[in-house]
């Protein structure tokens, strides 16, 4: 015959542990039910009655199966210079991220401790790896036959147009100029953009500073600033 299924609360066998989604109550000395995410323990179990759970109140949450007497408070509302990417619900805390065009350079458990502007690749360099909510843009030099003439955190290197007769050869920061009225093949007009990370979707006008130095990349290093990435702009 199969072993009988024990219903909570029950006394565990000596040396055994409680099952998944149960906890051992020291006072009752019984295995008791945990409360589901979004709930908390309103009344702890006894030898004869199981845990009584109740829903979290507004602006509080529990993310895990638990037996806490009170739900955790959601973090304060996102400030005007942050974006709420996850709302406060009964099952999850609010998460605030950096504003568009910025990334989190030093994170904390819920949200960000220090935001920094996304690096911009200067002409002659394109985006090798786009920025995300928690990582900066990586720039790379445009390979022979490609160019970028923009200062941008999204533009990649584009192929030079192919001319019947070349008036001015293209280089890393300029497209080829053809003598004939139309090239044999050309890219569609406008820069090629990489997909934006969540935090930069509604991109507002961003700085296009001149010097080829980057915002310091040392935020997560134990020492001072490291040399800037080649082909980027910033401070």
């Amino acid at each position: 015959l199969p072993a009988q299924v024990a219903f909570t609360p029950y006394a565990p066998e000596p040396g055994s542990t409680c099952r998944l989604r149960e906890y051992y109550d020291q006072t009752a000395q019984m295995c008791c039910s945990k409360c589901s995410p979004g709930q908390h323990a309103k009344v702890f179990c006894t030898k004869t009655s199981d845990t009584v759970c109740d829903s979290c109140e507004d602006s509080t949450y529990t993310q895990l199966w638990n037996w806490v007497p009170e739900c955790l408070s959601c973090g304060s509302r996102c400030s005007s210079d942050q974006v709420e990417t996850q709302a406060c619900t009964r099952e999850q805390n609010r998460i605030c991220t950096c504003r568009p065009g910025w990334y989190c350079a030093l994170s904390k458990q819920e949200g960000c401790r220090l935001c920094a502007p996304l690096r911009k690749c200067r002409p002659g360099f394109g985006v090798a790896r786009p920025g995300t909510e928690t990582s900066d843009v990586v720039c790379k030099p445009c390979a022979p036959g490609t160019f970028s003439n923009t200062t941008s955190s999204t533009d990649i290197c584009r192929p030079h147009q192919i001319c019947n007769v070349v008036a001015i050869p293209g280089n890393a920061s300029m497209d080829a100029v053809c003598t004939s009225t139309s090239p044999t093949r050309s890219m569609a007009p406008g820069a090629v953009h990489l997909p934006q990370p969540v935090s930069t979707r509604s991109q507002h006008t961003q700085p296009t500073p001149e010097p080829s130095t980057a915002p310091s990349t040392s935020f997560l290093l134990p020492m001072g600033p490291s040399p800037p990435a080649e082909g980027s702009t910033g401070d």
Epitope: S79, S80, D81, Q82, C98, G101, C104, L106, K108, G111, C112, R113, L114, C115, A116, P117, H204, T205, Q206, P207, T208, P209, E210, P211, P215, S216, S218, F219, L220, L221, P222, M223, G224, P225, G234, D235
Partner: antibody
Framework: QVQLVQSGAEVKKPGASVKVSCKAS????????IHWVRQAPGQGLEWMGW????????NYNEKFKDRVTMTRDTSISTAYMELSRLRSDDTAVYYC????????????WGQGTTVTVSS | DIQMTQSPSSLSASVGDRVTITCKAS??????VAWYQQKPGKAPKLLIY???TRHTGVPSRFSGSGSGTDFTLTISSLQPEDFATYYC?????????FGQGTKLEIK
Amino acid sequence: QVQLVQSGAEVKKPGASVKVSCKASGYTFTESIIHWVRQAPGQGLEWMGWFYPGSDNINYNEKFKDRVTMTRDTSISTAYMELSRLRSDDTAVYYCARHEGPYVYFDYWGQGTTVTVSS
Amino acid sequence: DIQMTQSPSSLSASVGDRVTITCKASQDVSTAVAWYQQKPGKAPKLLIYWTSTRHTGVPSRFSGSGSGTDFTLTISSLQPEDFATYYCQHHYSTPYTFGQGTKLEIK
């Protein structure tokens, strides 16, 4: 309420080092970045660098990185800024400051520590 | 480094006057500019951040505007307690730099 209380005035000789302290209260010390800013007599403000007490992350202004060391003692919620090889032009008021959110504008400042470098 | 150039360096005005201080960044800093007020022997006090957002408790007579490289702080009607030195600061990227200050004096 948040308070940053700094150590008292110091007089040092050229070539010496000075260590300024900044005791934090009214918030969890390991949750906020501490910055150091200095102001020479009659001059503007100059950012020296930041230090995150929660994990020892540091970002020094290139101008000071060979001479400045920022440390902390979490047991007493205190941050320190040590400046070595002092010169007369290091005579200034040194401030610790912090920012509430993730962007670097300073909403809390220490009262300042005057450091005089004179032979 | 991004330089912040303030003008004028000093300014005489009377109570009730409207005063404008300008700050020019050497590079585009978007709208990441803050303004501080400092009185002799005291630490600076944050007035405005993100160009135009007033810090908690700052009177509505203080306002800021601008974007890119040109920024202004305006005090619409000077009060006796407003005579102080004002600094702009970009909070765009390291190293964070300040303007050299504008000293506002009583005429």
